[in-house]
C-alpha cells in the first residue's frame, strides 16, 4: 500500500488484534439449509450481539445453530459482560458518511441511523433490510462515533462503550478507560464475505473479523453485503479503525497514507430478493 496522504493511523509491528468472538462460527449468518422441516433453533446475531431464534429446515446449514438459547449463549456470548471498549483516534469522516440515506430494495422495514450531511447529525431512517449503502448504522452511538464531528471540528472516536450485561447491547459510557482490543467499527465489517448472486469473478477484499485482517475474495458482481471493498486499503480504512491499540511507549504514532477515493459499486441487475 502506498503511504503518502493525511489519514492518521496507528502503526504497530503486529497486525491489529482480531475481534474477540469466542468461536468464528458465531459470525456466520443464520442458515436454514435446503430442507423443509420447521425446527426452532437459535443462532448468534453479530449485529444485535444476541442469541436469537430462527427456523431450521433440518439439514445442512452451518455451525451457528443451537438447540437452546442457553447453548447459544454459552458458545457465543462472553462472560465478562462489562468489558469496556475505548477509542481515541482522531480521523477524517469516512467517505460514506456523505452518502444519502438509502433504504435499499427490500421491504423488511426497520429503523436504522445515517449521517445527514445537511443537518450535520445522525438521524434515524427507514431501512428496507438489505443492500443500500454504508451510511447505515444499527445504533445512534455507532453513527455518531464514526460520522459526527467532535467538539473541535475534527472527527474523534471518543466514546467509551460498555457491553450492557442485560442484553449484550452497546451503550455509551462517559468514563475514560484504557483501551482494550475490541471492535468498535461499522457492524458490516463483522459479516462474512458474500460472493453474491451473479456469475462474475471480480477481485474484492473483505474484512475478516476473526483474524483481524483484510482478505481477498471473488465477488460475483451483484448482491452480497457491504463487507466488500475494491482495494485492501479501502477495506482497512473502513474496518480497522474499529480497533485501537495502545502502543507500549504510551503514544500514538501517526503515518500518512494515500487515500483512494474509489468506492464499491454494486450492480443490482440480477438480484433475487426474498420476501422478508
Amino acid at each position: 500500500d502506498s503511504e503518502e496522504d493525511e489519514e492518521h493511523t496507528i502503526i504497530t509491528d503486529t497486525e491489529l488484534p482480531p475481534l474477540k468472538l469466542m468461536h468464528s462460527f458465531c459470525a456466520f449468518k443464520a442458515d436454514d439449509g435446503p430442507c423443509k422441516a420447521i425446527m426452532k433453533r437459535f443462532f448468534f446475531n453479530i449485529f444485535t450481539r444476541q442469541c436469537e431464534e430462527f427456523i431450521y429446515g433440518g439439514c445442512e446449514g452451518n455451525q451457528n445453530r443451537f438447540e437452546s438459547l442457553e447453548e447459544c449463549k454459552k458458545m457465543c456470548t462472553r462472560d465478562n459482560a462489562n468489558r469496556i471498549i475505548k477509542t481515541t483516534l482522531q480521523q477524517e469522516k469516512p467517505d460514506f458518511c456523505f452518502l444519502e440515506e438509502d433504504p435499499g430494495i427490500c421491504r423488511g422495514y426497520i429503523t436504522r441511523y445515517f449521517y445527514n450531511n445537511q443537518t450535520k447529525q445522525c438521524e434515524r431512517f427507514k431501512y428496507g433490510g438489505c443492500l443500500g449503502n454504508m451510511n447505515n448504522f444499527e445504533t445512534l452511538e455507532e453513527c455518531k462515533n464514526i460520522c459526527e464531528d467532535g467538539p473541535n471540528g475534527f472527527q474523534v472516536d471518543n466514546y467509551g462503550t460498555q457491553l450492557n450485561a442485560v442484553n449484550n447491547s452497546l451503550t455509551p459510557q462517559s468514563t475514560k478507560v484504557p483501551s482494550l482490543f475490541e471492535f468498535h467499527g461499522p457492524s458490516w465489517c463483522l459479516t462474512p464475505a458474500d460472493r453474491g448472486l451473479c456469475r462474475a469473478n471480480e477481485n474484492r477484499f473483505y474484512y475478516n473479523s476473526v483474524i483481524g485482517k483484510c482478505r481477498p475474495f471473488k465477488y460475483s458482481g451483484c448482491g452480497g453485503n457491504e463487507n466488500n471493498f475494491t482495494s485492501k486499503q479501502e477495506c482497512l480504512r473502513a474496518c480497522k479503525k474499529g480497533f485501537i491499540q495502545r502502543i507500549s511507549k504510551g503514544g500514538l504514532i501517526k503515518t500518512k497514507r494515500k487515500r483512494k477515493k474509489q468506492r464499491v459499486k454494486i450492480a443490482y441487475e440480477e438480484i433475487f430478493v426474498k420476501n422478508m
Epitope: 444485535t48 436469537e52 440515506e101 422495514y109 426497520i110 429503523t111 441511523y113 445527514n116 445537511q118 443537518t119 447529525q121 445522525c122 438521524e123 434515524r124 431512517f125 427507514k126 445512534l140 442484553n167 447491547s169
Partner: antibody, heavy 119, light 108 residues
C-alpha cells in the same frame, strides 16, 4: 412553549377527501418529524405516517400509502394530512405529534381533530 | 408489522394497590425502541416511559418499566387516583410503528 394546534372537526361523506392541518409553534419546525396518528372511537392508536419538513422526507404506514398524503409548509410551520376515498371506518380522532430525528418519542401532541364519515 | 398485544384489556384496582400491565410483541423488539403512553378521557396521549424504563419528565417514581425481547411490563407500585387512565405500549423498531390496543386502568 411548544404547541401543535389542529384544525376543527370535519363531517364527510363516504368517498370524499379530507385535509387536516397542524400548526406548530415554539420550536424549529424543520428540525423535527411530524407524525399523524389516529384513534377510532374506543380503540387504540394507529400510526399513519411521518414527515420531516426540511428535506421533505416522508414515511407512510403501507396501510395508508395509497390514500394518505402528508405535506408541510415551512413558511407557516404547518403540517397537513389529506386522506382520500373516505369510508365509515375512517371515523376517528386524528392527532399530529412531533418527535426528534433520533427517536420516536412523541413528546408533544395536537389536541386532535374529529373526522366523522357518514352518509 | 409487529403486533403489540396488551393485557389485561381492563384492570380494576383500588388506590394503594400494585398494578402490572403487560405488552407482548409478535416479534422481538429492542428495549430501546419500546415506549409507553398514558391517555385520559378527552385528551391526547402523553409520553410516559421511553426506552422500556426511562420515565418521561413529570412521571412519578412509583411508575417503572421493564422487559426485553417480546415481553414488556409497566408497573405502578402503589396506585394514586390520578393514575387511572389508559396506557398504550408503542414500538418504533420496525415500520410501520405500532401501538398496543391499550390497557384501561379503572378504579374498583
Amino acid at each position: 412553549e411548544v404547541q401543535l394546534v389542529q384544525s376543527g372537526a370535519e363531517l364527510k361523506k363516504p368517498g370524499a377527501s379530507v385535509k387536516l392541518s397542524c400548526k406548530a409553534s415554539g420550536y424549529t419546525f424543520t428540525s423535527y418529524w411530524m407524525h399523524w396518528v389516529r384513534q377510532a372511537p374506543g380503540q387504540g392508536l394507529e400510526w399513519i405516517g411521518e414527515i420531516k419538513p426540511d428535506q421533505g422526507r416522508i414515511n407512510y404506514n403501507e396501510k395508508f400509502k395509497t390514500r394518505a398524503t402528508l405535506t408541510a409548509d415551512k413558511s407557516t410551520s404547518t403540517a397537513y394530512m389529506e386522506l382520500s376515498s373516505l369510508r365509515s371506518e375512517d371515523t376517528a380522532v386524528y392527532y399530529c405529534a412531533r418527535s426528534s430525528v433520533v427517536d420516536v418519542a412523541l413528546d408533544y401532541w395536537g389536541q386532535g381533530t374529529t373526522v366523522t364519515v357518514s352518509s | 408489522e409487529i403486533v403489540l398485544t396488551q393485557s389485561p384489556a381492563t384492570l380494576s384496582l383500588s388506590p394503594g394497590e400494585r398494578a402490572t400491565l403487560s405488552c407482548s410483541a409478535s416479534s422481538s423488539v429492542s428495549s430501546s425502541y419500546l415506549y409507553w403512553y398514558q391517555q385520559k378521557p378527552g385528551q391526547a396521549p402523553r409520553l410516559w416511559i421511553s426506552g422500556t424504563s426511562i420515565l418521561a419528565s413529570g412521571v412519578p417514581a412509583r411508575f417503572s418499566g421493564s422487559g426485553s425481547g417480546t415481553k414488556y411490563t409497566l408497573t405502578i407500585s402503589s396506585l394514586e387516583p390520578e393514575d387511572f387512565a389508559v396506557y398504550f405500549c408503542h414500538q418504533w423498531s420496525h415500520y410501520p410503528f405500532t401501538f398496543g390496543q391499550g390497557t384501561k386502568l379503572e378504579i374498583k
